[in-house]
């Protein structure tokens, strides 16, 4: 059968299961004259044989763990044993069977963890190796905690990444571990091959002793700092300490202040660098961060609170250069003339801002001094001795001392004596008739002019007219502005008119003075007027209850989950049909009747969050008017992206032969959200069989170093599998391959003879 089992000499690859006794030939090579026979060389291990007639076979079971690939060469020889064709590469790939059990590298592990360590952050790795192929279930290891001792309230304080063997705290462990209560724990860990999924898997166990140590990385107590300190700066105000020496400390100002008056030294001591001013800012909240030598955060940041304590460094201030009040000439003793309100920038409700008022001078002192008094703490001026007469003294000037506990300020008050308010405002007509307006009349439109007159002294509070709508407009849709020179009132629309809720409104106006009327005079019907507002219907679009609706869900919610809802009402009371617009990713559907929004496809934060769509509310029937609102779906991150290489690493090479062990640095990334601290990847070799030649060591949360363990490498390409684990919840792992070529170099570059230009590495190590 030419083709599958026989044929001419050409490069070929065959796959054979290990552990199987030979049952058939591998291939029958056919010779072309002058070739008469074949020769087999390479990694035969005395297992692979070629017969004179070109029959390639193997004579005993293969062992993948001894050699996973046999690189053979077959040449066609003439009758003199001289090569006339080839040699060509024949690759025998040995397929794995589960013939090796996993074994822990240590029968006992010891580690320590600080209380309150971040959940999911590994503090210890157990490591088992299985000589079987890690690319198959046979070599895929699955770690489990068999038992935790002691187990308090049946709560697990520790968890293990079942792929990497990374041991970390659970959320409960982070919160509850306390060395004072229980300083040590023991875990029994099992490892199974077959990814833990088969009853035929092999297993091993190991013991882990864990010491719990105190965590001193804690937020200090809030600090109080007196403002305007005259002590030499910087002044130490508090401190933070990382659990181990060598941390690099920094402060983060979340508020992005133009002036950030704090610093931290490399001991963790925090300083205020300049005097603070409570009146500029009365409290600061910032963060202390501890980082490793590579600039990666060691833990969560600590919140530092600084409260600025007030001192009395501000005098009282007057509300204006001169405060003007009016008093009618017949006002009674004790009547309030007005209140002088001074200010103090010092802290409210403290002695530093508590003010006293005192009249220090009255001019003129006619008919006598002491006509006025001021309430010491309230600042209210009252008539103290007798009624005043305008023709005798039309104006008084008071100098008032306002003081806090340390400062005094003089404020000036002018009191104008005005005629008695014995005339009421009188409307020029009592009924302004009917006014018909469409409900969509613009806000701000003047719809009516009203006029009343007052015979009291012009340009005083006795003759000034204020118009109020006292009836017929409980919604406050209308307002009246008064022209201070003419006392004309302009009725304006302040809120949209609405046919549906108020088709006809009987409006009543009242005209009144800011000054009280004299005793015995009262407002009567002359001070009231009415008009009827008739609103006509306009077919209006539905109205959403919000301009933007927002909802927040986890990106891994099940399809069909309700993720939010919108509501709109039609002013005419018609039913509403809801629809979506701009659902470019096809993630959502809306219930046409209720406005509830559901997911119809897997959501993905990494594709973009928030996801913005438009919701449309359309009248059912009528003129089918519609309106549009926004729906913003904020997607919360789930650890659903395994780590990967940050860039393309094809083209890595070492010059062959190696004169000394070499190394190269690579970077990992993933697409999940890494808020304050950035990714915290852990790195390990993807297969136990790589450990003789390579080692991988973590540099920081994103970078690692791949190093050779020796210099005896063949001149060929090696594919190094590396496991990268993100330590997330749940932890995800990516297996990536770094192709590394060992090649002859010319001037530091890989040398390839002409005709072999494919895949030339471009990066030398």
């Amino acid at each position: 059968q030419e083709g599958k089992f026989s044929g001419p000499l050409k490069p070929m690859t065959f796959s054979i299961y290990e552990g199987q006794e030979p049952s058939q030939i591998i291939f029958q090579f056919k010779a072309n004259p002058p070739a008469v026979t074949f020769e087999l060389t390479g990694e035969t291990d005395n297992i692979f044989v070629i017969e004179r007639e070109g029959l390639l076979y193997y004579n005993r079971a293969l062992d993948r763990e001894t050699r996973s690939t046999h690189n053979l060469q077959v040449a066609a020889l003439d009758a003199n044993g001289i090569i006339v064709e080839g040699p060509v590469p024949i690759t025998i790939k040995v397929k794995d069977i589960n013939d090796n059990r996993p074994t822990f590298l240590q029968s006992k592990y010891e580690g320590s963890v600080r209380q309150n360590s971040r959940p999911g952050k590994p503090f210890l790795y157990v490591n088992a190796t299985d000589l079987d192929d890690p690319a198959t279930p046979n070599g895929q290891l699955y770690y489990q905690i068999v038992i935790q001792l002691p187990m308090i309230n049946n709560v697990m304080y520790f968890q293990i990444n079942n792929k990497t063997g990374a041991i970390s705290l659970t959320r409960e462990g982070s919160q509850e571990l306390n060395p004072a209560k229980n300083p040590s724990y023991n875990l029994v860990i099992s490892v199974k091959d077959m990814g833990g999924q088969s009853e035929n898997s092999f297993s091993d166990t190991t013991s882990v002793d864990i010491i719990v140590t105190e965590n001193i990385w804690k937020a200090p107590k809030p600090v109080e700092m007196v403002e305007n300190s005259t002590d030499p700066h910087p002044i130490k105000i508090t401190q933070v300490r990382w659990n181990d020496p060598g941390a690099q400390y920094s402060l983060v100002d979340k508020e992005k202040l133009p002036r950030f008056p704090f610093s931290i030294d490399q001991e963790g001591d925090i300083y205020v660098t300049q005097p603070l001013d409570r009146e500029e800012k009365d409290a600061y909240v910032f963060y202390a961060v501890a980082k490793d030598e590579y600039g990666k955060p060691l833990s969560y940041p600590l919140e530092i609170h600084v409260k600025v304590k007030d001192i009395n460094d501000n005098p009282p201030t007057c509300p204006s250069p001169v405060t003007v009040f009016e008093v009618q000439e017949n006002e009674r003793l004790g009547n309030s003339i007005g209140t002088l309100t001074a200010h103090d920038r010092d802290e409210e409700n403290t002695a530093n801002s508590f003010l006293n008022y005192r009249i220090v001078e009255q001019t003129p002192k006619l008919p006598m001094d002491g006509l006025f008094l001021i309430q010491t703490y309230a600042g209210m001026l009252q008539l103290a001795k007798q009624s005043l007469k305008k023709q005798d003294t039309p104006q008084y000037n008071l100098t008032i001392e306002v003081s806090d506990k340390d400062f005094k300020t003089l404020c000036f008050v002018q009191i104008n004596v005005i005629d008695i308010n014995d005339q009421i405002p009188i409307f020029e007509k009592s009924d302004y008739g009917n006014l018909t307006l469409a409900e969509d009349t613009n806000i701000g439109s003047t719809i009516l002019t009203i006029q009343a007159t007052d015979a009291d002294e012009p340009f005083t509070g006795s003759s000034k007219i204020l118009y109020h709508i006292i009836k017929g407009d409980s919604e406050g849709r209308l307002g009246v502005d008064t022209d201070p020179h003419t006392n004309t009132g302009y009725v304006i629309i302040k809120k949209p008119l609405d046919f549906e809720t108020a088709a006809v409104s009987n409006i009543v106006f009242k005209a009144e003075n800011p000054e009280p009327l004299v005793f015995g005079v009262k407002y009567n019907a002359s001070s009231f007027a009415k008009f009827t507002l008739i609103v006509t219907d306009v077919n209006e679009a539905p109205q959403f209850s919000q301009h933007v609706f927002q909802a927040k869900v986890s990106e891994d919610v099940a399809i069909g989950t309700k993720v939010g809802n919108v509501t709109a009402k039609d002013p005419e009371g018609l039913d509403i049909s809801y629809s979506l617009r701009g659902d470019t990713r096809g993630w959502l559907k809306i219930d046409h009747v209720t406005g509830e929004i559901f997911s119809v496809a897997p959501l993905d934060r990494e594709a973009g969050s928030p996801y913005r769509v438009q919701v449309v509310a359309t009248e059912v029937g009528g003129s089918s008017l519609s309106s549009v609102s926004e729906f913003h779906l904020i997607l919360m991150d789930v650890n659903d992206n395994p780590p990967r290489l940050a860039k393309d690493y094809t083209g890595l090479f070492f010059c062959h032969p190696l004169s000394a062990p070499g190394s190269l640095i690579f970077e990992a990334t993933d697409d999940d959200q890494h808020l304050f601290r950035g990714p915290h990847f852990t790195f390990s070799l993807g297969s136990g069989s790589l450990q003789n030649d390579w080692e991988v060591s973590k540099i920081n949360g994103t970078h690692a170093r791949l190093s050779t363990r020796h210099t005896e490498f063949e001149e060929r390409e090696y594919v190094v599998l590396i496991r990268i684990n993100d330590g997330g919840r749940p932890p995800l792992e990516g297996i990536v391959s770094l192709p590394v070529t060992f090649c002859s170099c010319v001037e530091g570059s890989c040398f390839r003879p002409a005709g072999h230009q494919t895949g030339i590495p471009t990066v030398g190590m």
Partner: antibody, heavy 123, light 107 residues
Framework: QVQLQQSDAELVKPGASVKISCKVS????????IHWMKQRPDQGLDWIGY????????QYNENFKAKSTLTADKSSSTAYMQLNSLTSEDSAVYFC????????????????WGQGTSVTVSS | DIVMTQSQTFMSTTVGDRVSITCKAS??????LAWYQQKPRQSPKLLIY???NRFTGVPDRFTGSGSGTDFTLTISNMRSEDLADYVC?????????FGSGTKLEIR
């Protein structure tokens, strides 16, 4: 023991042909190749070509392709070389020799030689 | 074709001497090289194959070395019966080619 017995010396006229024989004994003719060499007085050896009697495969030196024809007769365990269109340049001693290699061996080289056949081309 | 050069056509020697005869190939032949001894009016005899392997029955005073393009035949303790022509041959590729020979003479 292995022996290669060549035919006797030949005196031939220019333009004529000659066929030299090489009879082997002590082994099977089809197991090894037979090579032919030319040696002129006080000169080095020139390789003419070989024949593999088992499959009648031949390979020639380009310089002798037109001049020589190699054959073998398995029944008589004899190899032959015919030289045609002879000129004085063809006057030389011609050797046959067995190539030592066979499948499974690591020996190479011409391990057994005939005694040589002198060919003289003269009018 | 691969040219085999034996630069010393003649070499004078004395019984008991150590003699080294060289052969240079015009291109890499690996170890596909044989040495032959030819005495006057006799056929050549195979001494060395694969550059360094002694053929059956060859005395151990004959040693071959080298690979690639440069090869040496050494006679460690010259005897009178060793006076002969020594010829190298490559069998890396066709056509097979011989060196011109080096003749050993008594000084």
């Amino acid at each position: 023991q292995v022996q290669l017995q060549q035919s006797d010396a030949e005196l031939v006229k220019p333009g004529a042909s000659v066929k030299i024989s090489c009879k082997v004994s002590g082994y099977t003719l089809t197991d090894h190749t037979i090579h032919w060499m030319k040696q002129r007085p006080d000169q080095g050896l020139d390789w003419i070509g070989y024949i593999y009697p088992r499959d009648d495969i031949t390979q020639y030196n380009e310089n002798f392709k037109a001049k020589s024809t190699l054959t073998a007769d398995k029944s008589s365990s004899t190899a032959y070389m015919q030289l045609n269109s002879l000129t004085s340049e063809d006057s030389a001693v011609y050797f046959c020799a067995r190539w030592s290699w066979h499948f499974g061996s690591n020996y190479y080289g011409l391990d057994y030689w005939g005694q040589g056949t002198s060919v003289t081309v003269s009018s | 074709d691969i040219v085999m050069t034996q630069s010393q056509t003649f070499m004078s020697t004395t019984v008991g001497d150590r003699v080294s005869i060289t052969c240079k190939a015009s291109q890499n032949v690996g170890t596909a090289l044989a040495w032959y001894q030819q005495k006057p009016r006799q056929s050549p005899k195979l001494l060395i194959y694969s550059a360094s392997n002694r053929f059956t029955g060859v005395p151990d005073r004959f040693t071959g070395s080298g690979s690639g393009t440069d090869f040496t035949l050494t006679i460690s303790n010259m005897r009178s019966e060793d006076l002969a022509d020594y010829v190298c041959q490559q069998y890396s590729t066709y056509p097979l080619t011989f060196g011109s020979g080096t003749k050993l003479e008594i000084r």
